[in-house]
Amino acid sequence: QERRFQLEGPESLTVQEGLCVLVPCRLPTTLPASYYGYGYWFLEGADVPVATNDPDEEVQEETRGRFHLLWDPRRKNCSLSIRDARRRDNAAYFFRLKSKWMKYGYTSSKLSVRVMALTHRPNISIPGTLESGHPSNLTCSVPWVCEQGTPPIFSWMSAAPTSLGPRTTQSSVLTITPRPQDHSTNLTCQVTFPGAGVTMERTIQLNVSYAPQKVAISIFQGNSAAFKILQNTSSLPVLEGQALRLLCDADGNPPAHLSWFQGFPALNATPISNTGVLELPQVGSAEEGDFTCRAQHPLGSLQISLSLFVHWKPEGRAGGV
């Protein structure tokens, strides 16, 4: 008794779990003008529909609210919308049009729906650069999520000070006010699809711009071990004629520009070294006094000074008189 018709389009469709898919269906052109009724989508081998527009018909518990018949007889549309796809939706489906008046219905060919693992991951976007102490809005987005699906749950994880901003079906905004110590730490956006019970995440390393917070000088005297000074030092005794290597080191991101000056420089002073290393091959009277290392950075500068006090060799002094 049943009349058969062929579904147009592919024989199988693929969807990632948690996402949506539309199973296309058009009512047969052979349908008599007066034949009308209700539409039913069935899982192959089942007699309870997964979706229907018949108010007197129950649908399968497993698909209720996720599978919808998109019914528009004027446009001959009988498509099936599946949202929050689950692994167990992986099956063959067919459509049936049944009139309450007639003993025969119109049954479509089968179409297979393949549900694959979710491979899409969230995107994290950062507008411009992250600056220490300045709030920035980070957006975690899942543009591949369909609007009609169950809205995903967004979770953020970060050591930096944060607050949650607005969210949509497809995105969540996090306001972050990073500190210098948050540079190179991880920030994770985790997205859970409650309709399918799937979780995806993306982790990025924060690149925080910050001015130098610490500057230090390491001193190498001849072959002796280096020592480090972390604050301005009034006097460092050095033996006359000794080779001295001063190494300046500062934090900050991106790295600060290090330069050495003799004395206490004015802003536009000319450095005696344009790197963090100052070589003094033979300390003499010309080297007695102050040396300053300046760490220059777009977000701020820091400097540290060191005062050299030259000890004269006794024989050297006598020879000079």
Partner: antibody, heavy 116, light 107 residues
Framework: EVQLVQSGGGVVQPGRSLTLSCAAF????????MHWVRQAPGKGLEWVAV????????YYADSVKGRFTISRDISKNTLYLQMNSLRTEDTAVYYC?????????WGQGTMVTVSS | SYVLTQPPLVSVSPGQTARITCSGE??????ASWYQQKPGQSPMLIIY???KRPSEIPERFSGSNSGSTVTLTISGTQPMDEADYYC??????????FGTGTKVTVL
Amino acid sequence: EVQLVQSGGGVVQPGRSLTLSCAAFGFTFSTYTMHWVRQAPGKGLEWVAVISYDEGFKYYADSVKGRFTISRDISKNTLYLQMNSLRTEDTAVYYCAREASAFDIWGQGTMVTVSS
Amino acid sequence: SYVLTQPPLVSVSPGQTARITCSGENWGQKYASWYQQKPGQSPMLIIYEDTKRPSEIPERFSGSNSGSTVTLTISGTQPMDEADYYCQAWDDSTGGVFGTGTKVTVL
């Protein structure tokens, strides 16, 4: 109580128009397909028109095609039959009926007399 | 157009069985419904989908569909069953179709 209450009948001259109404009570009107059926004096029942619950399907008996229009207003829970170019042979009691598996609920009927 | 033919009159004695036939084409593909109409009243559904009976309809009313003819049977007919009876079906091209109607008289 589930019921259909009809109004709008009367006497009308040939070629004129008339609109019948059928108000639904006690059930979810928007989920049911509705029909109009008529019965000429001393005659049998004659099916007239159908409108599906979603308004996606409308169909008419050949005798009224092009002259009668079936419609519904979900917000008012009301079914209508707009009858144009009326003829003397349209004289009948008109019934609205709800379709479940068949015509399970009927209105009380309203008389339409087409006479010059 | 599609026509459903019924006998105009069926007479039955009280307590006896009345059978009303309704002949038409392709009954094997269609569901039959039956309606009872008493004078001055709206029709009332008594049988749908060939054999099914609404809960408020007495069991003495039953329906059958042989594929060529559908039949309404009233077992143990009572005087209150005196009425006009109409079969009804849906046709692919005509739409809704009612039978010619049968008057049941209880003698």
